[in-house]
């Protein structure tokens, strides 16, 4: 059978039929349904939602829909012993306490089981001491404090503002600096956009609003007690002392009303420069401790949360492929939320639901995709990407042999300005071609393509006339598929204007105010941006699952490899003397990149010319494309990060959310001037260049003619 016979409809008609079936009104309805009560991981409510989704996906027409459960380490506040922070006087009396919960949004006052703000996986403890303000608690902030200002955080409680980097990195940095507790807060400079009202009158964060979130440093491990293996019924679990990535000091988040009360009394050193000042009416003094009048007062944390092994449930739906059922294209997003999940994750889950419905409609009309499509509703993403990682660990042998691509589907929106895409270079051309075929939803771009509005609003910094596409980092469920298994991955959502809105994420992220009404009133009343994201995500899945030749262009990898090699070389060249002294050469890497470029070019020529009616040759060429991403995996992983195995990309060691290129070399070079043993340090740089050069060369050879 030819592909067209197998799938019953001509390819163009298929894609159009699929896209035309997607409806904004359905996404709106699904979002409402998913956001009426909290769906915290490990709770009965989230289990019930899993069963509802299972049932509806079956009704939509998928071949099978199963629940996959795991017993993983989660973290919850103590219901009878709330977490809070106090200012205490010299007698130990609490003269101020931070809030115990957020004021509920209108209409939700009687909803039960709203988890109060907490930092998931914080250990218990009641440390007290002087406060030190550490800005965003980034690596460079601690360098400024310790090296330039000579401020010692040892034995202090640090207060850091949310934003710029993943909160787990902030906590890790504070621990390394010797802090005995961490207070995280949302500063209006980062979470209150000028000229916009606070919720419920606008999309800004009110003073009582607080960002929840986990503070783990898992580095891709999944469940902290079963790294590398699924947390199944017969799992061997580590003791809590050996668990991966748990913080060692108490941590708690607060809103800016409470932060004002802590920061207004700060004394000690003045902020080093304006980049350390937020928007509160406080001096932003660094400390340590309070000013003269209040110098005998201290800060005390009261943290009583518990870590508990708890059952979680993924929903896995299958639409079997007609021609290549053993090739999997995966669309996955999480279902668990901190509270209502109005944006995170349900704006994404509603889109997945509508994509499943559309695929199901085509299937009921007799169509099947060429390749198998797997749909996933992941659990416990908010607790460290646990559901997706455990499932991938359980199915790793199948995935590494059969996984074509993974498309992530968390929040569909973080703004309503333009498209944002992060993906493997293999998908650049797919994304470009698809967005040229889709209509832009943006005002002022009526009748224009999505590609055009996207390129105008978010131009590529390197290539004129093209849109920006970013590197994949982490902080979401694609991590295990891309960084550990080497499956080509991508993600797309609508975003804000980063030029005019310099706050981090969206203001109400992980707060109780992330409701259906937030989306329906302020972000996307017509659900046109949600529909566009559904078309992009769904369109990518459709093409990946249905095109005869996989829509991957290996030449785009060659282009970025050269760019990344140039970048890492220029970083190294900031140390010309040491490069000379220790005979550090990048020749092997540049040579490998050159070879990759030439081989990729020849492969692309052969791809144009080969006989697509020969199923063996077709399968061979497609396998070379599928396995190219896999070829960038080093089985030994990155130093001290065994589950980050991709040699070209890894989450930044300083910010999990950001992607770093040639991470092994980058980390070896980072702060190298401060290393006590320069010979050893530069030896590691040379080793990492060797690993990178070998990997690029080995990947290139997978594209060579097979014999």
């Amino acid at each position: 059978k030819s592909s067209n016979e197998a799938t019953n409809i001509t390819p163009k008609h298929n894609m159009k039929a699929f896209l035309d079936e997607l409806k904004a009104e359905n996404i709106k309805k699904f979002l409402y349904n998913f956001t009426q009560i909290p769906h915290l991981a490990g709770t009965e409510q989230n289990f019930q939602l899993a069963k509802q989704i299972q049932s509806q996906w079956k009704e939509f027409g998928l071949d099978s829909v199963e629940l996959a459960h795991y017993d993983v380490l989660l973290s919850y506040p103590n219901k009878t012993h709330p977490n809070y922070i106090s200012i205490i006087n010299e007698d130990g009396n609490e003269i101020f306490n931070t809030s115990l919960f957020e004021p509920p949004p209108p209409g939700y006052e009687n909803v039960s089981d709203i988890v109060p703000p907490f930092s998931a996986f914080s250990p218990q403890g009641m440390p007290e001491g002087d406060l030190v303000y550490v800005n965003y608690a980034r690596t460079e902030d601690f360098f400024k404090l310790e090296r330039d200002m000579k401020i010692n955080c040892s034995g202090k409680i640090v207060i850091a503002r949310y934003g710029k980097v993943f909160r787990g990195n902030k906590v890790k940095n504070a621990q390394l600096a010797g802090a005995k507790g961490v207070i995280l807060y949302s500063d209006p400079a980062d979470y209150f956009a000028p000229g916009v009202k606070s919720y419920p009158d606008g999309w800004n964060l009110p003073g009582g609003g607080v960002q929840r979130g986990n503070i783990l440093n898992l580095n891709g491990a999944g469940d902290p007690l079963t790294p590398g293996y699924p947390a199944n019924e017969y799992a061997y679990r580590r003791g809590i002392a050996e668990a991966v990535g748990l913080p060692s000091i108490p941590v708690h988040p607060i809103g800016y009303y409470d932060a004002q009360k802590l920061l207004e009394k700060m004394g000690g050193s003045a902020p080093p420069d304006s980049s350390w000042r937020g928007s509160l009416k406080v001096p932003y003094n660094v400390g340590p401790g309070f000013t003269g009048n209040f110098s005998t007062q201290k800060v005390k944390m009261h943290i009583h949360s518990t870590n508990e092994v708890t059952r979680i449930y993924n929903v896995i739906g299958t639409l079997r492929g007609a021609v290549e059922p053993d090739r999997y294209v995966i669309l996955g997003g999480h279902r668990d939320s901190w509270v209502f999940g109005g944006i995170d994750p349900q704006s994404g889950a509603a889109v997945v639901h509508e994509i499943v419905r559309s695929f199901g409609t085509l299937k009921k009309e007799g169509w099947r995709p060429r390749r198998t499509i797997l749909f996933a509703s992941w659990d416990a993403e908010e607790f460290g990407l646990l559901g997706s990682t455990e499932w991938a660990e359980e199915n790793s042998r199948l995935l590494q042999e059969r996984g074509v691509a993974y498309i992530n589907a968390d929040s569909s929106i973080e703004g309503n300005y333009t498209l944002r895409v992060d993906c493997t270079p293999l998908m650049y051309s797919l994304v470009h071609n698809l967005t040229k075929e889709l209509k832009s939803p943006d005002e002022g771009f009526e009748g224009k393509s999505l590609y055009e509005s996207w390129t105008k609003k978010s131009p590529s910094p390197e290539f004129s006339g093209m849109p920006r596409i970013s590197k994949l980092g982490s902080g979401n469920d694609f991590e295990v598929f891309f960084q550990r298994l080497g499956i080509a991955s991508g993600r797309a959502r609508y975003t804000k204007n980063w030029e005019t809105n310099k706050f981090s994420g969206y203001p109400l992220y992980h707060s109780v105010y992330e409701t259906y009404e937030l989306v329906e009133k302020f972000y996307d009343p017509m659900f046109k941006y949600h529909l566009t994201v559904a078309q992009v995500r769904g369109g990518m899945v459709f093409e990946l699952a249905n095109s005869i030749v996989l829509p991957f262009d290996c030449r785009d990898y060659a282009v970025v490899l050269r760019k990344y090699a140039d970048k890492i070389y220029s970083i190294s060249m900031k140390h010309p003397q040491e490069m000379k002294t220790y005979s550090v050469s990048f020749d092997s890497l540049f040579s490998a990149v050159k070879n990759f470029t030439e081989i990729a070019s020849k492969f692309s020529e052969r791809l144009q010319d080969f006989d697509k009616s020969n199923p063996i040759v077709l399968r061979m060429m497609n396998d070379q494309l599928m396995f190219l991403e896999r070829a960038f995996i080093d089985p030994l992983g990155l130093p001290d990060r065994p589950f980050y195995r991709h040699v070209i990309y890894a989450p930044s060691s300083h910010n999990k959310y950001a992607g770093e290129s040639f991470p092994g070399i980058y980390d070896a070079l980072f702060d190298i001037e401060s290393k006590v043993d320069p010979s050893k340090a530069w030896g590691e740089v040379k080793r990492q260049i060797y690993v990178a050069a070998f990997t690029v060369q080995a990947a290139a050879e997978t594209l060579s003619e097979v014999a």
Partner: nanobody, 123 residues
């Protein structure tokens, strides 16, 4: 209709106790800090006590500190003032008043008042 209704006032002897209640309707008590304010005969208004929306902080006027306790039951939409060791100078009309700002951590301007309940302390 948005309203606050105080109850529990009356005449008591010095040293005795009273418990005032304030029932809220037409708005969610759970989102707002609440105050007790009093007005002695022929005098101006005096702030007595404040409790944050979540009960995490309570503030008192020096004149009542250690004798009065403000509390709330958000599930019942009710605010309380437990008054112990009453003195003649506590004689006043007691009003509950809703804070203007959602989630405020310290007393702010009031925007809704009750009709008041009279407390008379005399021997």
């Amino acid at each position: 209709e948005v309203q606050l209704v105080e109850s529990g006032g009356g005449a008591v002897q010095p040293g005795r106790s009273l418990r005032l209640s304030c029932a809220a309707s037409g708005f969610p008590l759970i989102s707002y800090g609440m105050n007790w304010v009093r007005q002695a005969p022929g005098k101006g208004l005096d702030w007595v006590a404040f409790i944050t929306y979540d009960g995490s902080n309570r503030y008192y006027a020096d004149s009542v500190k250690g004798r009065f306790t403000i509390s709330r039951d958000n599930s019942k939409n009710t605010l309380y003032l437990q008054m112990n060791s009453l003195r003649p100078e506590d004689t006043a009309v007691y009003y509950c008043a809703k804070d203007r700002i959602v989630g405020a951590r310290v007393p702010d301007a009031y925007d809704i008042w009750g009709q008041g309940t009279m407390v008379t302390v005399s021997s």
